[in-house]
C-alpha cells in the first residue's frame, strides 16, 4: 500500500531512506531542456521476490531540442553539481542489496535527471532525518519517521528532531557540536522504537552506516 503523503517536513532538515521497500516508486523526471524518451517509463518500481529486489524500468532522458532521438548528452560537472534534493542523496550504495531482503538500494543516477528525486513510499518505509549544513540537531527522540497504516489510513510518525543554527547556543545538556558537516548519522538511529522486523533490520543497518552516506548532492 502506497503512503498517502511524503514524510513530514522538519525545518532545516532533510530525510533519506537507507533502502526502499518493494512497491516504492520513483518518478522518471528530466532536468530543464531534456524530456523522457518517446514512450519512456514514467516510473521506476522496486520489485522482487524473497531473495532479490531490484528496480523495474529505466529512466531515460533525451534533449528536448532533438525529436525522435535517444542520444544523451553527458552533463558538464557544473550541471551535475546543481542536482540537489530534499532527500539526502548518495552516489554510493552503502548496503549490500542482499543484506536487506525486500528492499532496493538507491538507484544510480541517470543522465540528465531532474534536480529532485520524487519517491512514492509504501507502508513500512522508514526514513532518517538530519539537519542541513549550518544547522545542528537537538534530539528529543528518534530522528526517523515510519509510514504506518492505522484505521485504514496511512500516516508518518513524527520525527523527534529540532535543527538549530550553529550560532544559537541552546542545546541539551551534554550535547556536543558535530565534527563533520553535513552532520553525521543521527545518534537516535540506534534507538528505534518500532518492533517490526523490517524496521529492526533497517535500524541495525543504519547503525552501521558511515557518515559519508549523508551527502546532499551527487559529486
Amino acid at each position: 500500500e502506497l503512503c498517502d503523503d511524503d514524510p513530514p517536513e522538519i525545518p532545516h532538515a532533510t530525510f533519506k531512506a537507507m533502502a526502499y521497500k518493494e512497491g516504492t516508486m520513483l518518478n522518471c523526471e528530466c532536468k530543464r531542456g531534456f524530456r523522457r524518451i518517446k514512450s519512456g517509463s514514467l516510473y521506476m518500481l522496486c520489485t522482487g521476490n524473497s531473495s532479490h529486489s531490484s528496480w523495474d524500468n529505466q529512466c531515460q532522458c533525451t534533449s528536448s531540442a532533438t525529436r525522435n532521438t535517444t542520444k544523451q548528452v553527458t552533463p558538464q560537472p557544473e550541471e551535475q553539481k546543481e542536482r540537489k534534493t530534499t532527500e539526502m542523496q548518495s552516489p554510493m550504495q552503502p548496503v549490500d542489496q542482499a543484506s536487506l531482503p525486500g528492499h532496493c538500494r538507491e538507484p544510480p543516477p541517470w543522465e540528465n535527471e531532474a534536480t529532485e528525486r520524487i519517491y512514492h513510499f509504501v507502508v513500512g518505509q522508514m526514513v532518517y532525518y538530519q539537519c542541513v549544513q549550518g544547522y545542528r540537531a537537538l534530539h528529543r527522540g528518534p530522528a526517523e519517521s515510519v509510514c504506518k497504516m492505522t484505521h485504514g489510513k496511512t500516516r508518518w510518525t513524527q520525527p523527534q528532531l529540532i535543527c538549530t543554527g550553529e550560532m544559537e547556543t541552546s542545546q541539551f545538556p551534554g550535547e556536543e557540536k558535530p565534527q563533520a558537516s553535513p552532520e553525521g548519522r543521527p545518534e537516535s538511529e540506534t534507538s528505534c522504537l518500532v518492533t517490526t522486523t523490517d524496521f529492526q533490520i533497517q535500524t541495525e543497518m543504519a547503525a552501521t552506516m558511515e557518515t559519508s552516506i549523508f551527502t546532499t548532492e551527487y559529486q
Epitope: 498517502d4 511524503d6 518518478n27 523526471e29 523522457r36 517509463s41 514514467l42 531532474a114 520524487i118
Partner: antibody, heavy 115, light 108 residues
Amino acid sequence: QVQLVQSGAEVKKPGSSVKVSCKASGGTFSRYPINWVRQAPGQGLEWMGRIIPILGIADYAQRFQGRVTITADKSTNTAYMELSSLRSEDTAVYYCARRDWGDYWGQGTLVTVSS
Amino acid sequence: EIVLTQSPGTLSLSPGERATLSCRASQSVSSSFLAWYQQKPGQAPRLLIYGASSRATGIPDRFSGSGSGTDFTLTISRLEPEDFAVYYCQQYSSSPLTFGGGTKVEIK
C-alpha cells in the same frame, strides 16, 4: 485530509483564453504530480498534461501542445491550467488530480465556450 | 501512445450480481501501472484501484483488480445500489497518460 479546490465556472468567447486554478490543502503538494483532465459533456476522460510543482516542469498531451500552459505556485499550493484559442469543442468540465493515478481530485470546473 | 479499450460499453446487471469489466491495452503496461476509477453523474472520478490490484484508501473489498501486461480486469463481487456508475481504466506507465472509453454499469 487532502483536498483540491478548483475555481468557479467560466463562460468564454471563442478565441479567448481561460485559466483554471486548483488549490491543494492537507497533504503533499509540491513533490507530487498535479494532472489536468477534461471531460466534454457525455464523453470520457481526456488527459491534458501535468506538472510537478517542485520541479516546475510541465508535460503536455500532444493535441494540446502550444495551446495549454500548466503552472504551479508552491507558496500558495496552487496549480493552474490555462487554455488559449478556445473553441466550442473545449466546452467541458476540467479537473485537477494529484498523482498520476489520481488519488485525489478537484470538484471540477465547467468551462463553457460560446459566442 | 497506449490505447486502452474497455468492454463491454454497457453492463446491465441487478444488485447482488457480480460485475466483470475488461480493459485491454494496445501495448504492454509496464509494472502494471494501471488504475480504475468510478464516476457518478455530476461528480469527479473516484480512485478505486491503482497498480492494477491495490485498493485505494476507503474502497470496499468487493472491488478487486487483476491482470498484467495488456489485459486487466475490475471485478465487483456483489453489486450494491451505489455501485451503478461509469468505470474508467487509466494507464500511468508512460506519457501521455491515457484513459479507456469507460464501461457503464446500469441497473437491469
